[in-house]
């Protein structure tokens, strides 16, 4: 058993049918010595008396808020949560496996630049009685500071018969140098509590591996005289690291017809302009990627050909 | 600010070209190592990230873009001093900081070259003959060093009398390649920046 926060305790259980469970001793936080009784949750049934209460925790029915009283007055509370270990592996019931970029990906994180700021998000089908708390650091043995905000519900989607909820959090490394070469990964730890179930999820990454630039901005077309060709120009996104000659991007320019089946013409360039043939009803899209370290491409920025 | 469209300074351009070749070569070699050594811990998540140049060179600090010198988190240690006769920059552009930066890059390349050559000698003794260093990558390191053209003491190639542990050697190869790829990215960024300055 360990303390998650004041008066909230996590009992780790080897989870299988007929498991013996864990013996837990609760102590009433009071100078009083006698006349103390214990109850669980809203029930008035007295579970025991005395300054300590010994219980055998086996299932969720044994978890909850234990309260010690004296003469009708509440002295203190202890909330017991359960953390299930199923055949040597901690349970992952609360969050959905996003399966990207690989199986067992519960947390996904992205950074728009090298400033040390990043966003993580996760999915769940649970709508109520759910709380998250997020901690992060650079490295784990001698951790350096990363500050995370509160996790917030950022999107709701309908997936088949189920509703899916997306939560996200923003974090910022306390002293980040955009040009630094990372040797210790960022660690992100999410504590999830649903009713009386506790779970924790972790992700470990280098900022360089989670970079996804914003789409190029100010995408414009300039028709070339006496030609079907157009000059496409764009700019680096405002959120990208500066100077741009050091943090350079490379670009992919795509001409896409109205029909998805039509052949796509693609051009790759390090410049912020390109000359392409604009077909009727087609659209031109441009996306960006770090020129020197191949992390994710940005989303497309698009303009119609007409 | 967009990348300049002006023709790059011919004095700088060879280094930019060589540094791009270097990144391509090390990335290819790392990919080959990850595929060939699939049963070894060779992915970024599995290896220890070691930097053989740590405390010996200070490339990131010495080559910091001017715009980032205001960022205190970037200014850890900039006291290392190096020889200052680099030939990549036209002399009129050679400033002390640029020379320091290019000299630091040269020292990095020299250290990795020695490590890779020593490692290749061991890998050539492996009866499995599973993986060797790409000669193209070694040649590209050499070309960039020549383009930088710094006079520096030659480091003797390490020789080991004991029987090599091929498993450990292959894991060390993965560690070296990951670190060298990261340094090659920095070198490419620096060359691009200097080329645009």
């Amino acid at each position: 058993i360990w303390e998650l926060k004041k008066d909230v305790y996590v009992v780790e259980l080897d989870w299988y049918p007929d498991a013996p469970g864990e013996m837990v001793v609760l102590t009433c936080d009071t100078p009083e010595e006698d006349g103390i009784t214990w109850t669980l949750d809203q029930s008035s049934e007295v579970l025991g008396s005395g300054k300590t209460l010994t219980i055998q925790v086996k299932e969720f029915g044994d978890a909850g808020q234990y309260t010690c009283h004296k003469g009708g007055e509440v002295l203190s509370h202890s909330l017991l949560l359960l953390h299930k270990k199923e055949d040597g592996i901690w349970s992952t019931d609360i969050l959905k496996d996003q399966k990207e970029p690989k199986n067992k990906t519960f947390l996904r994180c992205e950074a728009k630049n090298y400033s040390g700021r990043f966003t993580c998000w996760w999915l769940t089908t649970i709508s109520t009685d759910l709380t998250f708390s997020v901690k992060s650091s650079r490295g784990s043995s001698d951790p350096q500071g990363v500050t995370c905000g509160a996790a917030t519900l950022s999107a709701e989607r309908v997936r088949g018969d189920n509703k899916e909820y997306e939560y996200s959090v923003e974090c910022q490394e306390d002293s980040a140098c955009p040009a630094a070469e990372e040797s210790l990964p960022i660690e992100v730890m999410v504590d999830a509590v649903h009713k009386l179930k506790y779970e924790n999820y972790t992700s470990s990454f280098f900022i360089r591996d989670i970079i996804k630039p914003d789409p190029p901005k100010n995408l414009q077309l300039k028709p070339l005289k006496n030609s079907r060709q157009v000059e496409v120009s764009w700019e680096y996104p405002d959120t990208w690291s500066t100077p741009h000659s050091y943090f350079s991007l490379t670009f992919c320019v795509q001409v896409q017809g109205k029909s998805k089946r039509e052949k796509k013409d693609r051009v790759f360039t390090d410049k912020t302009s390109a000359t392409v043939i604009c077909r009727k009803n087609a659209s031109i899209s441009v996306r960006a990627q770090d020129r020197y370290y191949s992390s994710s491409w940005s989303e497309w920025a698009s303009v119609p050909c007409s | 600010r967009n990348l300049p469209v002006a023709t790059p300074d011919p004095g700088m351009f060879p280094c930019l070209h060589h540094s791009q070749n270097l990144l391509r070569a090390v990335s290819n070699m790392l990919q080959k190592a990850r595929q060939t050594l699939e049963f070894y811990p060779c992915t970024s998540e599995e290896i220890d990230h070691e930097d053989i140049t740590k405390d010996k060179t200070s490339t990131v600090e010495a080559c910091l873009p001017l715009e980032l010198t205001k960022n205190e988190s970037c200014l850890n240690s900039r006291e290392t001093s190096f020889i200052t006769n680099g030939s990549c920059l036209a002399s009129r552009k050679t400033s002390f900081m640029m020379a320091l930066c290019l000299s630091s890059i040269y020292e990095d390349l020299k250290m990795y070259q020695v490590e890779f050559k020593t490692m290749n000698a061991k890998l050539l003794m492996d009866p499995k003959r599973q993986i060797f260093l790409d000669q193209n990558m070694l040649a590209v390191i050499d070309e960039l060093m020549q383009a930088l053209n710094f006079n520096s003491e030659t480091v003797p190639q390490k020789s080991s009398l004991e029987e090599p542990d091929f498993y450990k050697t292959k894991i060390k190869l993965c560690i070296l390649l990951h670190a060298f790829r990261i340094r090659a990215v920095t070198i490419d960024r620096v060359m691009s920046y200097l080329n645009a300055s």
Epitope: Y16, P17, D18, D93 | -
Partner: antibody, heavy 115, light 112 residues
Framework: QVQLVQSGGGVVQPGRSLRLSCAAS????????MHWVRQAPGKGLEWVAF????????YYADSVKGRFTISRDNSKNTLYLQMKSLRAEDTAVYYC????????WGQGTMVTVSS | SYVLTQPPSVSGTPGQRVTISCSGG????????VKWYQQLPGTAPKLLIY???YRPSGVPDRFSGSKSGTSASLAITGVQAEDEADYYC????????????FGTGTKVTVLG
Amino acid sequence: QVQLVQSGGGVVQPGRSLRLSCAASGFTFSSYGMHWVRQAPGKGLEWVAFIRYDGSNKYYADSVKGRFTISRDNSKNTLYLQMKSLRAEDTAVYYCKTHGSHDNWGQGTMVTVSS
Amino acid sequence: SYVLTQPPSVSGTPGQRVTISCSGGRSNIGSNTVKWYQQLPGTAPKLLIYGNDYRPSGVPDRFSGSKSGTSASLAITGVQAEDEADYYCQSYDRGTHPALLFGTGTKVTVLG
């Protein structure tokens, strides 16, 4: 004590369907994940499928994906395996099993796919 | 389809020490715990070892398990006639959990 009693096995022609049941008692069935495992005559153990305690997630072996469906009725304390488009290579003893470091197995039920 | 490899058979005389190996990889045994089962003819498998080296109550202490790196092994010290059976190791793969990965199985024969 924990008990898993299986039923529903038998002889079936290729291409036909069969449903296996596994009735649980002696524990809170709705709190635990469950597996199906099979063993072809004279062969080793092969995992078939898994279902979460609440039925929210199901996982299948590639060899049965799209043909077999694992399900559970927590109000009846019963686990099911619906098998469709049966093939000769599905012939095996099928076991249900609890998920956990200590597990409990059903007695097994024989499924024979033969024309 | 078996990723965990066991020797097809091992044998020993009563009282001898018999060991069965189970060889896997970094993503299965290297990352997860190992179980061992004993299966007597015509019966369901019985758990012998869980969590690499823990014995459930009721399992004789002549059975012991161990794990090192990407391999595990089951040892029977002082093998007895009633130990003649098939033995299977089981683990998970970190990418496909909770799918069970079983070993190929080993037939233990007690001679004499």
